[in-house]
Amino acid sequence: EPTMYGEILSPNYPQAYPSEVEKSWDIEVPEGYGIHLYFTHLDIELSENCAYDSVQIISGDTEEGRLCGQRSSNNPHSPIVEEFQVPYNKLQVIFKSDFSNEERFTGFAAYYVATDINECTDFVDVPCSHFCNNFIGGYFCSCPPEYFLHDDMKNCGVNCSGDVFTALIGEIASPNYPKPYPENSRCEYQIRLEKGFQVVVTLRREDFDVEAADSAGNCLDSLVFVAGDRQFGPYCGHGFPGPLNIETKSNALDIIFQTDLTGQKKGWKLRYHGDPMPCPKEDTPNSVWEPAKAKYVFRDVVQITCLDGFEVVEGRVGATSFYSTCQSNGKWSNSKLKCQPVDCGIPESIENGKVEDPESTLFGSVIRYTCEEPYYYMENGGGGEYHCAGNGSWVNEVLGPELPKCVPVCGVPREPFEEKQRIIGGSDADIKNFPWQVFFDNPWAGGALINEYWVLTAAHVVEGNREPTMYVGSTSVQTSRLAKSKMLTPEHVFIHPGWKLLEVPEGRTNFDNDIALVRLKDPVKMGPTVSPICLPGTSSDYNLMDGDLGLISGWGRTEKRDRAVRLKAARLPVAPLRKCKEVKVEKPTADAEAYVFTPNMICAGGEKGMDSCKGDSGGAFAVQDPNDKTKFYAAGLVSWGPQCGTYGLYTRVKNYVDWIMKTMQENSTPRED
């Protein structure tokens, strides 16, 4: 707690002070006072620089004095032997003694009193800008006429702030212009125009004279313009150093004039006016501005239209143009919108084909679709090349945006059939020689794959089982092989309407229209062991002549076994129908005359005992396409025969092409269209 006076005595005073002592006293008097400290007695062991014993007087970080030895008063009327006067209200006194004293020293007696300080004169830094008034315990500042005391109670200034200019044109000058401006003042002027207009300031060089900068280049008095986050200045010196025309790009401008205590000049005068806020003619790539003008100002509207192949993407919606308005802040509305290259996106995948991952999916990019060759080809043409068009679609020159369709290649076996190992009535074959060959397990029979969804077979194969289980892709029909092959699941069986259904099929003598189609639930994936056979064309080129060779294949009866384990095949010639009629039926179920022969039947065989037999029914009689020797077409289907190893009868497929196409069309899925 501060006190106005006090006494400080060395330890044991007036007796001798002890050795090895360190004691300190913290003196504090009230704020606004200084301290007068005086010693009336001093008897401390003397040493050089008072190194042994001493009394130390410290003010803040400054040592005011260090005392030792004996002192006596020079004035017979005063007991004071040493005194200190500090203009601060705190003081520290520290007494130290070392480990030994050669004599007996009595120490010191000291007193302090609070004394008034003259803040106006006692300090280097003058506390008041103009008039300083001292009183006991403090001071106050005052100002000359027309000046006022700032909130800091120290600085005086002219009341030159608070003016707000809202007119679109005006003039502003420093106080007293052209007479010297007041010192130590901060003048603030505000220009506030309607939004959409920018403040433009104009000055003449000769209308500006402000105290020049110091040697470091810092303005002592300064004029500053602040427009939002932009600042112009500070400016000072004789003649305006800045641009004579300042476009602030803002409707709000603050003018700040700051002066110090010295060096007043005539000041400054300026004019201002409001310009409609200009918006820059921005370079927006890949677009056209409408209307095109040299300069755009507040409230101007332009339509920005993207060039072909470019679009404005906002959210998920793409547009080809947008409007932009010159706003009050000098910025265009919708400035974030840009004309970007149209992105056609990742191209759709296609069944049984592929598209290479494009390097770019933007306007002008090119992609190529290919089919899984050699098992599929591109049915709808167009070459498979698509480019990213301006409308955001992948477009082909022929098909437009329609995707290419990969359809199975028909009639091309991966390996040609060669009659290698001669066995009675035929040869061992590989499924790759007859990839269209379908195996039916109940009844044991065959069929021909004609596309992804359809199997062609004989009507008598499916009349008794409308849900046949079929397999493709295996040479052997051993269980272990079929388990690894592709099983086909039927969706529906379509028997030709001309096929007569009998109560007792075993006694059949009429095999006319022995043809059926099986629609599959799922499409078949083509490959080296699974691939369709072609259908005959409707032209006369596909009319068979006697002696024309065809291939048959199947797992039917052989000389040795009722059912073949591995696929067998034979090459046989077409024969006149009468050759089939002439053969005696092996196990007749009726008179020989009862058996029906029609133009819907092909007779073939008779050479070296090569023939189809029980279990081969429904398989294709494959003939080389007369117009494309690399392909085979299903000229016939194994139907019936008078006797195995002689001549066989085959359903003439050419006569049913219309029915086949119509049935497939009427029962196709959207996926297949």
């Epitope: 195996f439 397990d441 044991w444 040479t475 052997s476 029909v477 051993q478 269980t479 272990s480 092989r481 079929l482 388990a483 690894k484 099983m487 040795k560 076994r561 059912r563 384990v565 591995r566």
Partner: antibody, heavy 119, light 107 residues
């Protein structure tokens, strides 16, 4: 009619080998796939392996790998199964069986050969 | 390898009873499953192939069902000749594994 005739019963000491034969009649071995199955007294059936003519390789059950060898002599239409490093638990009836078609697992079974392993 | 688990191991039943034997595969085998009947000292006899197809000559009281991993053999009305051991076998892929067998005995 296809028939499979197996060699007669054998008694072997532990560590020895046994070779069982299976002669095909009424068909050729090349047209068939021969499998071998065994059954220990009072125990279940165990598939041992087969020759896969499509792949041209012999496939052995994991359990017998390294101890069994199946061979075929097409000139005599005879199949062989040799089991080495015999132990008492190999005592069983060994069957040769032809693979069936179109889902039938086995078609024709041999009469079985009893192999007894005893010290 | 595909493991085949048959249950129960033993089944006691009377003539005329409806009997069901279950076979579970450790992974899907589609319908590639067969059921056999075996009598002491005899080779196994095929009853059912492809999970549900009845071998010719087998009485119609035997039926099979299931696909994937769960299969059953049902004898609709047990006859004296049916007391035997029954095995399931998968033929989907090698190894062609058998179940451990179910013995059907007289109650």
């Amino acid at each position: 009619e296809v028939q499979l005739v197996q060699s007669g019963a054998e008694v072997k000491k532990p560590g020895a080998s046994v070779k069982v034969s299976c002669k095909v009649s009424g068909d050729t071995l090349t047209e068939l796939s021969m499998h071998w199955v065994r059954q220990a007294p009072g125990k279940g059936l165990e598939w041992m392996g087969t020759f896969d003519p499509e792949e041209g390789e012999t496939i052995y059950a994991q359990k017998f790998q390294g101890r069994v060898t199946m061979t075929e002599d097409t000139s005599t239409d005879t199949a062989y199964m040799e089991l080495s490093s015999l132990r008492s638990e190999d005592t069983a009836v060994y069957y040769c069986v032809t693979e069936g078609l179109a889902g039938f697992p086995f078609d024709i079974w041999g009469q079985g050969t009893l192999v007894t392993v005893s010290s | 390898d595909i493991q085949m688990t048959q249950s129960p191991s033993t089944l006691s039943a009377s003539v005329g009873d409806r009997v069901t034997i279950t076979c579970r595969a450790s992974q899907s085998i589609s319908s590639w499953l067969a059921w056999y009947q075996q009598k002491p000292g005899k080779a196994p006899k095929l009853l059912i192939y492809k999970a549900s197809s009845l071998e010719s000559g087998v009485p119609s009281r035997f039926s099979g069902s299931g696909s994937g991993t769960e299969f059953t053999l049902t004898i609709s009305s047990l006859q004296p000749d049916d007391f035997a051991t029954y095995y399931c076998q998968q033929v989907n892929s090698y190894d062609w594994t058998f179940g451990q067998g179910t013995k059907v005995e007289i109650k």
